[in-house]
C-alpha cells in the first residue's frame, strides 16, 4: 500500500531505538501466512515448540498469533543521539508465555518462553509492504528479516532496498 521501505543502511542498530511505552498500543489476533499462502503453524514437540511453513488441508484451522504493537523512536543516522521519527514494532506470541525470537547467531527464528519485559530479540519492526503484505525486521539486527527457507522460518539478510520485495520475506496477516 504505502510502498516498500528500503533497507536500514545505518550502522547504528535499531536496538538503539527506544520503545515508547511498556504496554502495547494495541493487540491483534491473526493468522500468519506467506506471500504464497502457506500457513505458519506451531507444534509442541518434546516440551518445545516448532515452527512450520506448510500447506493446510481444506477446512483445516489456521494457527493464530497475537501481535502486540509498540510505538518506538527511530534513531537518527546523523550524530547518533538524535531521533528520526517514529516506527511500529511488534512482538508475536502464538501461545501464552511464548514469543518468536530472533536468534541472530544461528540465523533462526525460535519460540522462547519468557517473562516480561521481553528481550530485544522478541521485537520486530513492522513494515507495511505492497500487495497487502508486511515484513518483520529484527530490532537487534537491522536489514535482517523473518523469512522462509526450506519450509521453516529463518532470518534473511536483505542487502539492498531493491530486494525488499523478495517474496520470501513477505507475509500476510488475516483474521480468518
Amino acid at each position: 500500500a504505502f510502498g516498500i521501505s528500503g533497507v536500514q543502511k545505518y550502522t547504528r542498530a535499531l536496538h538503539d531505538s527506544s520503545i515508547t511505552g511498556i504496554s502495547p498500543i494495541t493487540e491483534y489476533l491473526a493468522s500468519l501466512s506467506t506471500y504464497n499462502d502457506q500457513s505458519i503453524t506451531f507444534a509442541l514437540e518434546d516440551e518445545s515448540y516448532e515452527i512450520y511453513v506448510e500447506d493446510l488441508k481444506k477446512d483445516e484451522k489456521k494457527d493464530k498469533v497475537l501481535l502486540s504493537y509498540y510505538e518506538s523512536q527511530h534513531p537518527s543516522n546523523e550524530s547518533g543521539d538524535g531521533v528520526d521519527g517514529k516506527m511500529l514494532m511488534v512482538t508475536l506470541s502464538p501461545t501464552k508465555d511464548f514469543w518468536l525470537h530472533a536468534n541472530n547467531k544461528e540465523h533462526s527464528v525460535e519460540l522462547h518462553k519468557c517473562e516480561k519485559p521481553l528481550p530485544d530479540q522478541a521485537f520486530f519492526v513492522l513494515h507495511n509492504m505492497h500487495s497487502n503484505c508486511v515484513s518483520f525486521e529484527c530490532k537487534t539486527d537491522p536489514g535482517v528479516f523473518i523469512g522462509v527457507k526450506d519450509n521453516h522460518l529463518a532470518l534473511i539478510k536483505v542487502d539492498s532496498s531493491e530486494n525488499l520485495c523478495t517474496e520470501n520475506i513477505l507475509f500476510k496477516l488475516s483474521e480468518t
Partner: antibody, heavy 119, light 111 residues
C-alpha cells in the same frame, strides 16, 4: 537534521511539461518510501504519487495516471515528479513527503514548490 | 476510494478552551488491527505537520495536549487547552489504501 527541499515549480502553459525535484538530506534516502502531495490554492491536500525505497513500486492518484511519473535517484538522494500534459486543475503547491520507517504514514514534509498552469 | 468527512468546518474558540475535531470515514480504515488514520496541522504558508498517527499516537515532538481517539470509521482529535500557536487548519488522512485521502480540513480560529 532531516530535510526535504523541493524545486522546479513555476508557470507553465496548459499542455506543457515540468519536472519537480526534491533534494533529501539527514537520513538514509533509499530506506524510505517517498511521495508527492499537492494543495491547490486555498484548498485541501491531495496525495499524488508514491514510490518505494527500492524503486520497485509506484502508485498514482487516478487524475494524474498516464501524465505524471514519479521516480528517484538514490545515489543523488533526489525524488522527481515528471509532469506532462499539464492542466489548469494541476495548479497547486507540490509537497515532497517522506514516510516513517516502515511506511505507515507521511512523517516529514518539504516546504513545497508552486506550479501554476495558465495561458 | 475512502472519503473522509471532517466536522465542523470551522471552530471558533478562545485560548485555554478545549477543541474537539471530528473525522468520519466512508468505510473502516482498520488494517492489521491498526486504525490507519492520521492527523496533520497546517499553518498559513507552511507545510502540514504530523500530529497523530494510527489514530492515537503522537508524532515526534508533539505536545501532550494533542490526543487522538476512535476506531473503525469515527475519529476525534482533541486539543485539551488551546495555545495561541494551535490556531490553524487540521486535516485527517487515511493510509489504509491507495488512493491515500485527506479530509477537507477543520479551521480552528480565535473567537
Amino acid at each position: 537534521e532531516v530535510q526535504l527541499v523541493e524545486s522546479g515549480g513555476g508557470l507553465v502553459q496548459p499542455g506543457g511539461s515540468l519536472r519537480l525535484s526534491c533534494a533529501a538530506s539527514g537520513f538514509t534516502f533509499s530506506s524510505f518510501s517517498m511521495s508527492w502531495v499537492r494543495q491547490a490554492p486555498g484548498k485541501g491536500l491531495e496525495w499524488v504519487a508514491t514510490i518505494s525505497g527500492g524503486k520497485t513500486f509506484t502508485d498514482y492518484v487516478d487524475s494524474v495516471k498516464g501524465r505524471f511519473t514519479i521516480s528517484r535517484d538514490n545515489s543523488k538522494n533526489t525524488l522527481y515528479l515528471q509532469m506532462n500534459s499539464l492542466r489548469a486543475e494541476d495548479t497547486a503547491v507540490y509537497y515532497c513527503t517522506r514516510a516513517n520507517y516502515g511506511n505507515w504514514f507521511f512523517e516529514v514534509w518539504g516546504q513545497g514548490t508552486l506550479v501554476t498552469v495558465s495561458s | 476510494e475512502i472519503v473522509l468527512t471532517q466536522s465542523p468546518a470551522t471552530l471558533s474558540l478562545s485560548p485555554g478552551e478545549r477543541a474537539t475535531l471530528s473525522c468520519r470515514a466512508s468505510e473502516s480504515v482498520a488494517k492489521y488491527g491498526l486504525s490507519l488514520l492520521n492527523w496533520f496541522q497546517q499553518k498559513p504558508g507552511q507545510p502540514p505537520r504530523l500530529l497523530i498517527f494510527a489514530a492515537s499516537n503522537r508524532g515526534s515532538g508533539i505536545p501532550a495536549r494533542f490526543s487522538g481517539s476512535g476506531s473503525g470509521t469515527d475519529f476525534t482529535l482533541t486539543i485539551s487547552s488551546l495555545e495561541p500557536e494551535d490556531f490553524a487548519v487540521y486535516f485527517c488522512q487515511q493510509s489504509k489504501e491507495v488512493p491515500f485521502t485527506f479530509g477537507q480540513g477543520t479551521k480552528v480560529e480565535i473567537k
